[in-house]
């Protein structure tokens, strides 16, 4: 606890002090006082530098004195033999004696008292920036007029902070400008403009004179501009060293003027104004700006329009243009939006065709559709080449965005039919010779595939079974083969309206209009063993002449068996209708005259006993297309005959092309349209 005074006596004083002693005393007086330490008696063994015995006085880290020997007062009116005055409030006294004393020494008597110190004069470092006032136990600082004492209670400064400038134009100067600015001050000025305007500061070189930098280049007095995270300065010296026009890119600017205790100059003066925040004329590729200007500022709006083939993608929506506004922060709104090449996406697949995986699906890319040749061809033309158009669609020069349609190639067998050994006069055939051949198992009959969804057959085949089971793609109709072949499921049977339905079909004598269509539930996939036959054209080229050759095929009766196991075929010539009329009906169900012969019937056969027979009904009488020798068309359908192995009658398909087309059109699925 600090005390105002005290006494310090050597051990055993006033008796002789013992040998080998070390004793210390810590003196402390209150804060704001110094210590006056004085000795009234001193009798300590004398030695050089007081090496043997001594009393040592220490202030902080400094030795104030070291005493030994005998002392007496010089002043008869004062008992003081030695004294110390320290301006600090702490002092340490240390007494040491060695192992021997040649005489008897009595030691020392000392006293200390707290004394006032003059902080204003007693120290090298002046405690106050301006005026220092001493009092007992302390001091206080004071300031000249218009200065105020800072919170540290030592420094005086000018009250030059707190001004906020909001006007779009203004002038700011250092305190007292052009008279010397105050020392030891920190002046802060704030410019706060409306958002969207940047502060632009202008200075003249001659309007700036601030204490120059030291030898290390550090400004002793300085002017600094702070705009957000950007700083301009510090600046100092005679004449403004920075740019005379400072564009801060910010609506808020802090001006900080810091001065030290020395070297006051006239200071500085500046002007500022608010500029609408400029936005950079950005280079946005593949686009056009409207309006086009040399400079864009706050609140300017531009429409950015993508060039053809480019689009703005925002989320899942594609647009060709967008608006951008110059914002208060000097940045464009929607700056993330870019004109990217239009992406047409993965091209749609097509039935019975393919498109190679494109290397790119962007604007200008090219893809090619192909059909599964040789079984399908591109019906709607256009060559199958599509390019990625500006609107994001794959476009063909002819079809536009419409996809190509792969439709079955008709009338082209994978392998041509070659007659081998004689059979009713026919030969063994392979389904690849007659890929249009359809097998009906109940009743045992035939039909002709004419496209993916339709089978043409004789009306008498389906009149008794409107849900026939049909098979395609197999040469043999053995069970194990049919199980591997394609079974066709009917959706609806359309019998020609001119076909007369009878109570007892077995007694039929009129086979006029013996034609029917079967609509399939699912489309048939074409290939080497399954492929349609063409229909006849309507021109006179398709009128048959006597002697024209046609091919028939089927699993009907042969000389050896009621039903053929493997497909049989024969080539027969067209004959005059009278040839058929002349043949005696084998098992007549009525008078020979009752049998009806019409122009809707073709007579064929009579050569080498080649003929169709029971079980071949509905199969095609295939004739080479007069306009394309590589193709066959269904000129007739096996209908009836007077006697197997002679002449047979075939429905003349040309007479029914309109009905066939109309029926198919009216009963097509949307995907076929």
């Amino acid at each position: 606890e600090p005390t105002m005074y005290g006494e310090i006596l050597s051990p055993n004083y006033p008796q002789a002090y013992p040998s080998e002693v070390e004793k210390s005393w810590d003196i402390e007086v209150p804060e704001g006082y110094g210590i006056h330490l004085y000795f009234t008696h001193l009798d300590i063994e004398l030695s050089e530098n007081c090496a043997y015995d001594s009393v040592q006085i220490i202030s902080g880290d400094t030795e104030e004195g070291r005493l030994c020997g005998q002392r007496s007062s010089n002043n008869p009116h004062s008992p003081i033999v030695e004294e110390f005055q320290v301006p600090y409030n702490k002092l340490q006294v240390i007494f040491k004696s060695d192992f021997s004393n040649e005489e008897r020494f009595t030691g020392f008597a000392a006293y200390y008292v707290a004394t006032d110190i003059n902080e204003c004069t007693d120290f090298v470092d002046v405690p106050c920036s301006h005026f220092c006032n001493n009092f007992i136990g302390g001091y206080f600082c004071s300031c000249p007029p218009e200065y105020f004492l800072h919170d540290d209670m030592k420094n005086c400064g000018v009250n030059c902070s707190g001004d906020v400038f909001t006007a779009l134009i203004g002038e700011i100067a250092s305190p007292n400008y052009p008279k010397p600015y105050p020392e030891n001050s920190r002046c802060e000025y704030q410019i706060r403009l409306e958002k969207g305007f940047q502060v632009v500061v202008t200075l003249r070189r001659e309007d700036f004179d601030v204490e120059a930098a030291d030898s290390a280049g550090n400004c002793l007095d300085s002017l600094v501009f702070v705009a957000g995270d950007r700083q301009f300065g510090p600046y100092c010296g005679h004449g403004f060293p920075g740019p005379l026009n400072i564009e801060t890119k910010s609506n808020a600017l802090d001006i900080i003027f810091q001065t030290d205790l020395t070297g006051q100059k006239k200071g500085w003066k500046l002007r500022y104004h608010g500029d609408p925040m400029p936005c950079p004329k950005e280079d946005t590729p593949n686009s056009v700006w409207e309006p086009a200007k040399a400079k864009y500022v706050f609140r300017d709006v531009v429409q950015i329009t993508c060039l053809d083939g480019f689009e703005v993608v925002e989320g899942r929506v594609g647009a060709t243009s967008f608006y951008s506004t110059c914002q208060s922060n000097g940045k464009w709104s929607n700056s993330k939006l870019k004109c990217q090449p239009v992406d047409c996406g993965i091209p749609e697949s097509i039935e019975n065709g393919k498109v190679e995986d494109p290397e790119s699906t962007l604007f200008g890319s090219v893809i090619r559709y192909t059909c599964e040749e040789p079984y399908y061809y591109m019906e709607n033309g256009g060559g199958g080449e599509y390019h990625c158009a500006g609107n994001g669609s794959w476009v063909n020069e002819v079809l536009g965005p419409e996809l190509p349609k792969c439709v079955p190639v008709c009338g082209v067998p994978r392998e041509p039919f070659e007659e081998k050994q004689r059979i009713i006069g026919g030969s063994d055939a392979d389904i690849k010779n007659f890929p249009w051949q359809v097998f009906f198992d109940n009743p045992w009959a035939g039909g002709a595939l004419i496209n993916e969804y339709w089978v043409l057959t004789a009306a008498h085949v389906v009149e008794g079974n409107r849900e026939p089971t049909m098979y395609v793609g197999s040469t043999s109709v053995q069970t194990s083969r049919l199980a591997k072949s394609k079974m066709l499921t009917p959706e609806h049977v359309f019998i020609h309206p001119g076909w007369k339905l009878l109570e007892v079909p077995e007694g039929r004598t009129n086979f006029d209009n013996d034609i029917a269509l079967v609509r399939l539930k699912d489309p048939v996939k074409m290939g080497p063993t399954v492929s349609p036959i063409c229909l006849p054209g309507t021109s006179s080229d398709y009128n048959l002449m006597d002697g024209d050759l046609g091919l028939i095929s089927g699993w009907g009766r042969t000389e050896k068996r009621d039903r053929a196991v493997r497909l049989k075929a024969a080539r027969l010539p067209v004959a005059p209708l009278r040839k058929c009329k002349e043949v005696k009906v084998e098992k007549p169900t009525a008078d020979a005259e009752a049998y009806v012969f019409t122009p809707n019937m073709i007579c064929a056969g009579g050569e080498k006993g080649m003929d169709s027979c029971k079980g071949d009904s509905g199969g095609a009488f295939a004739v080479q297309d007069p306009n394309d020798k590589t193709k066959f068309y269904a000129a007739g359908l096996v209908s009836w005959g007077p006697q197997c192995g002679t002449y047979g009658l075939y429905t003349r398909v040309k007479n029914y092309v309109d009905w066939i087309m109309k029926t198919m059109q009216e009963n097509s699925t949307p995907r076929e349209d």
Partner: antibody, heavy 119, light 107 residues
């Protein structure tokens, strides 16, 4: 009408082989597909295999693979089935059967040949 | 090979009863299934082919149904001549396989 006439009953020792013949009349073997089916006494029917003329290969049931050989002599319209490495479980009536058309599995059955395997 | 499982193995019934035999294929066989009737010492007789088609000459009391993997043979009214063993057979893919048989006996 197709008729199938099989060879007579056979008694064989275990480990031996047996060859059963089946003569076709009323049609030619080339027009037909011949299957072989067997039935052990008091047991069920077992399909053994067939010659598939469309593929030109003989197909055997997994169970008989490696032990059975089916052949045809088209000049005599005769089909043969040879079963080797006979064991007592092979005692059965062996039938040759022609394949039917349009979903009918079998058309005509031979009269059957009893093969007895006994030591 | 496709496995065919018939149930039941044995069925006791009386004349006039409605009898149903089930056949299950180990994988889909579409409708390629046949049913046979066999009497002791005789070759099997085809009743039904393609799952539901009645062989000519077979009485209409026999009927078949099903497709895929589940099939049934139904005798609507059992007659004395119908006591026999019945087999199903798949003909979907070579190799063909038979069921193990169902014996229909007099109750």
């Amino acid at each position: 009408e197709v008729q199938l006439v099989q060879s007579g009953a056979e008694v064989k020792k275990p480990g031996a082989s047996v060859k059963v013949s089946c003569k076709v009349s009323g049609d030619t073997l080339t027009e037909l597909s011949m299957h072989w089916v067997r039935q052990a006494p008091g047991k069920g029917l077992e399909w053994m295999g067939t010659f598939d003329p469309e593929e030109g290969e003989t197909i055997y049931a997994q169970k008989f693979q490696g032990r059975v050989t089916m052949t045809e002599d088209t000049s005599t319209d005769t089909a043969y089935m040879e079963l080797s490495y006979l064991r007592s479980e092979d005692t059965a009536v062996y039938y040759c059967v022609t394949e039917g058309l349009a979903g009918i599995p079998f058309d005509s059955w031979g009269q059957g040949t009893l093969v007895t395997v006994s030591s | 090979d496709i496995q065919m499982t018939q149930s039941p193995s044995t069925l006791s019934a009386s004349v006039g009863d409605r009898v149903t035999i089930t056949c299950r294929a180990s994988q889909s066989i579409s409708s390629w299934l046949a049913w046979y009737q066999q009497k002791p010492g005789k070759a099997p007789k085809l009743l039904i082919y393609k799952a539901s088609s009645l062989e000519s000459g077979v009485p209409s009391r026999f009927s078949g149904s099903g497709s895929g993997t589940e099939f049934t043979l139904t005798i609507s009214s059992l007659q004395p001549d119908d006591f026999a063993t019945y087999y199903c057979q798949q003909v979907n893919s070579l190799s063909w396989t038979f069921g193990q048989g169902t014996k229909v006996e007099i109750k």
